[in-house]
């Protein structure tokens, strides 16, 4: 999916309103230093896309995050402001929500998740650079 | 059985202010788009704004903005739509309608509509 | 004034064709395939007969079919019946503006 066409304005809102929140709430024990950022991103459409993936494509040591509350904020987020993402993307998530087993917070997983956070802020810091 | 249902019929004076509710069951409240839509007497369908009980944020038509207020609750999985400043205008049906699962803007599910009446 | 224009009525024999369009902008009908078809029966609640342009809902009969050919969509009713007999609205997702526009409804009526 090309996220050129979204409203990062109204992203960057429903972010640091809610899905922010959910995210720091999973990572909640873990100190930030804990973790190295290794995924980044170098524009708007770029982080999207590096988000949509970590968020909602299963890793072999972390299977499934998508069931997770931030991850159903951010669909949800990329639904209602990305035009056309709906189309081409609820579908094939949907096949996650089969693919989970069972709800265990592995290493791997707040690692997955300390690199959403990075990415979440270079999306914003990226927003705010183009104002 | 899955169902929106909504209060009952109001007559308000010009001015004043409406509230109207939509209780949803048997569906998962929070993913879902919940708009509310007016239909004038003999006229066509109006969209006011839609609110995501996931994001609990709203977003209004542009006509609206400013006099609608749209809310929810997920405790109760109840969706409000409050419309301020009242004119005779405002004479409608008002149905809240289920905007399909992040296909928030096709309305697969409607309630029973709530007639609003306003008259000095 | 609706931003979608129908045509405020259209007519048919039963067991006739009738074909509804709905005419819009890039900004809307043309710049998205999200198109949606809503039944009406009088003092009723709207109900959804198309959507995505083509695409129906479990329960609606296969009589009812959409299109769409640049800005302006269409509805169509084969084998017309009684029950029919309806007002039909067209829908369109319009951008993360102005979110949904209506058409302004079209009465259909089985002679």
């Known amino acids: 999916y090309d996220f050129t066409n979204c409203d990062f304005q109204k992203i960057e809102a429903d972010y640091l309103r809610t899905i922010s929140k959910d995210l720091i709430t999973y990572m909640s024990g873990t100190k930030s230093t804990d973790f190295n950022n290794t995924v980044s991103c170098s524009n708007r459409p770029h982080c999207l896309t590096e988000i949509q993936s970590l968020t909602f494509n299963p890793t072999p040591r972390c299977a499934s995050l998508a069931k997770e509350m931030f991850a159903r904020k951010t669909k949800a987020t990329l639904a209602l402001w990305c035009p056309g993402y709906s189309e081409t993307q609820i579908n094939a998530t949907q096949a996650m929500k089969k693919a989970r087993k069972s709800k265990v917070t592995t290493n791997k997983c707040l690692e997955q998740v300390s690199q959403l956070l990075g990415l979440w802020r270079r999306f914003i810091r990226t927003l705010l650079k183009k104002q | 059985q899955v169902q929106l249902v909504q209060s009952g019929a109001e007559v308000k004076k010009p001015g004043s202010s409406v509230k109207v509710s939509c209780k949803a069951s048997?569906?998962?409240?929070?993913?879902?788009?919940i708009s509310w839509v007016r239909q004038a007497p003999g006229q066509g369908l109006e969209w006011l704004g839609v609110?995501?009980?996931?994001?609990?944020?709203?977003n209004y038509a542009e006509k609206f903005q400013g006099r609608v207020t749209i809310t929810a609750d997920t405790s109760t999985s109840t969706a409000y739509m409050e419309l301020s400043s009242l004119r005779s205008e405002d004479t409608a049906v008002y149905y809240c309608?289920?905007?399909?699962?992040?296909?928030?803007?096709?309305?697969?599910?409607w309630g029973q509509g709530t007639l609003v009446t306003v008259s000095s | 004034q609706s931003a979608l224009t129908q045509p405020p009525s259209a007519s048919g024999s039963p067991g006739q064709s009738v074909t509804i369009s709905c005419t819009g902008s890039?900004?809307?009908?043309?710049?998205?395939?999200?198109v949606s078809w809503y039944q009406q029966h009088p003092g009723k609640a709207p109900k959804l007969m198309i959507y995505?342009?083509?695409k129906r809902p479990s329960g609606v009969p296969d009589r009812f079919s959409g299109s769409k050919s640049g800005n302006t969509a269409s509805l169509t009713v084969s084998g017309l019946q009684a029950e029919d007999e309806a007002d039909y609205y067209c829908?369109?997702?319009?951008?993360?503006?102005?979110?949904?526009?209506f058409g302004g409804g079209t009465k259909l009526t089985v002679l």
């Open positions: 309608a289920r905007g399909a699962e992040y296909f928030y803007w096709y309305f697969d599910l």
């Open positions: 048997g569906f998962t409240f929070g993913s879902y788009g």
């Open positions: 609110i995501i009980p996931l994001l609990g944020v709203p």
């Open positions: 890039n900004s809307d009908i043309g710049g998205y395939n999200r």
């Open positions: 995505e342009i083509s």
């Open positions: 829908s369109s997702y319009a951008g993360t503006d102005t979110f949904v526009l």
